[in-house]
């Protein structure tokens, strides 16, 4: 009994699944006529067929017969050949349409359609567009509007032809979707905000496109807009000059750091050491007299302009070199000094000598062993072996030219 119920339930599920899966997808444009064929129906009456509809206009399944008549005729009627005719498809006509027909021989044929409707909106437009944008701050570029779409679809923005991703690199988008109370068509609005980079493109090109909700329909793009990017104040490079060059100084020596800003007026200059502000009054020059280990570190200056935010210079490294050592080259970060280099070379030299000695001893042993085993067959062979041994020798001694 339970097994029978289970089988029955499965048959029901599968039949419903089959009904959906086996359906032929039809897309129809709103306002246009639609003809759905009833397969297997005799071409002329008398016909044994019926259409079943489950759409936005029906409570559940609505049955239509070839006899027709009544208010439904204005929405859908069965044609003499058995096809179902909808004179002007509307949003409420989305749904399932089924036909069951029996031919003269009593063979039953079923047709199953899944109808979706669409409406392509007018070309989208950018309204309320800005002719100028301020660099470094968020600006409203404009609002893209698409009217009269079904399904809703989506709006997307492009910069110089490439898609703009919201919440990335100062890009934000505010979207709004409204549905017309009578037509049921959608109006989409998308407001674009961007923060143009200082020193970026002075004439960026923005456009907006509408992508339909149903596939196989191409996107519609607006005419592009090209606002100018305005930078209220010059973006000047903050230069940090170090004396002595390279920032390496002997203990007790003096380092002079100068912060050069070409901007007008002269901004306030603050100093940083290892990323921490130094508690000093603003000054374009920082003098470090009688350098000690505590003064070693990475220095930079920050210029604060009255008309725009702070700008930091490149960082320079200040290091102490022992007397007799040569400072690192300009721009290098600190110096290990020649002392360390000499030590490293000494160690390498020692290792090299040891390797050379071991190589020589092993070679001599091999030579002796070879002589004991057998004398060379001819002069050529002996020369060849000598050559081979010679080429091995320098490798063992770190390419040194001298013999043992």
């Amino acid at each position: 009994m339970a097994a029978g119920t289970a089988v029955g339930a499965w048959v029901l599920v599968l039949s419903l699944w089959g009904a959906v899966v086996g359906a032929q997808n039809i897309t129809a444009r709103i306002g246009e006529p639609l003809v759905l064929k009833c397969k297997g129906a005799p071409k002329k009456p008398p016909q044994r067929l019926e259409w079943k509809l489950n759409t936005g206009r029906t409570e559940a399944w609505k049955v239509l017969s070839p006899q027709g008549g009544g208010p439904w005729d204005s929405v859908a009627r069965v044609l003499p050949n058995g096809s179902l005719f909808l004179p002007a498809v509307g949003i409420q006509d989305e749904g399932i349409f089924r036909c069951q027909a029996m031919n003269r021989n009593g063979k039953e044929t079923k047709s199953n359609y899944r109808v979706r409707v669409y409406q392509i909106p007018g070309k989208p437009e950018i309204v309320d567009s800005a002719s100028e944008l301020t660099a470094g701050v968020p600006n409203k570029v404009g609002t893209c509007v698409s009217e009269g779409s079904y399904p809703a679809g989506t709006l997307s923005w492009h910069l110089d032809g490439k898609p703009l991703v919201p919440n990335e690199k100062g890009v934000s988008v505010k979207e709004q979707t409204r549905r017309h109370p009578e037509t049921g068509l959608f109006t989409l609005q998308s407001e674009l905000m961007v923060t143009p980079a200082r020193g970026g493109d002075p004439r960026p090109t923005f456009s907006c496109s509408f992508s339909p909700g149903l596939p196989r329909h191409r996107a519609l793009r607006t005419a592009p807009i090209q606002p100018r990017v305005w930078e209220p104040v010059p973006l000047e490079e903050v230069q940090l000059v170090v004396e002595p060059e390279g920032g390496a100084v002997a203990p007790g020596g003096t380092v002079t750091l100068t912060c050069e800003v070409p901007a007008q007026p002269s901004p306030q200059i603050h100093w940083m050491k290892d990323g921490v502000p130094l508690p000093l009054p603003p000054s374009p020059v920082l003098i470090l007299p009688e350098i000690g280990p505590q003064d070693q570190g990475t220095y930079s200056c920050v210029a604060t302009h009255s008309s725009h935010g702070p700008q930091e210079s490149r960082a320079v490294s200040i290091s102490i070199i022992e007397p007799g050592e040569e400072g690192p080259t300009a721009g290098s970060v600190g110096g290990s000094g020649l002392g360390t280099l000499a030590l490293a070379l000494g160690i390498l030299g020692g290792l090299g000598t040891a390797a050379l000695l071991i190589g020589v001893i092993l070679w001599q042993r091999r030579q002796r062993r070879g002589e004991e085993r057998k004398a060379p067959e001819n002069q050529e062979e002996e020369e060849e072996r000598a050559e081979l041994n010679q080429s091995e020798e320098p490798e063992a001694g770190e390419s040194s030219t001298g013999g043992p």
């Epitope: 002075p202 100018r228 990017v229 305005w230 930078e231 209220p232 010059p234």
Partner: nanobody, 120 residues
């Protein structure tokens, strides 16, 4: 090339107002981003306010925000600086400047300046 002539400076009591004008002649005025700068005795020239090509965008130095207003009339080739609630520290020679750089931020053309004196 553009020529700039400032006017409207003078002596005013603290708390008073002045309106500076800068008339431009030469090339198309709307191609230039405009700015006002000032230089007090013994000090560096400092930025005051700037306005974009169309006049839609403006920018001020912190010390004048809420008191000064920059505007422009492209039909009259003129840029204005309305100065309200003037303070003695606003005393300076005020210069008008024009920029035809891509971003409108490098000032290539300067006027001769107009003196503004605010007495306490």
């Amino acid at each position: 090339e553009v020529q700039l002539v400032e006017s409207g400076g003078g002596l005013v009591q603290a708390g008073g107002s002045l309106r500076l004008s800068c008339a431009a002649s030469g090339r198309t005025f709307s191609n230039y981003s405009m700015g006002w700068f000032r230089q007090a005795p013994g000090k560096e020239r400092e930025f005051v306010a700037t306005i974009s090509w169309s006049g839609a965008l403006t920018h001020y130095t912190d010390s004048v925000k809420g008191r000064f207003t920059i505007s422009r009339d492209n039909a009259k080739n003129t840029v204005y600086l309305q100065m309200n609630s003037l303070k003695p520290e606003d005393t300076a020679v005020y210069y008008c400047a024009a920029s035809d750089s891509d971003y409108g931020n490098k000032y290539d053309y300067w006027g001769q300046g107009t003196q503004v004196t605010v007495s306490s």
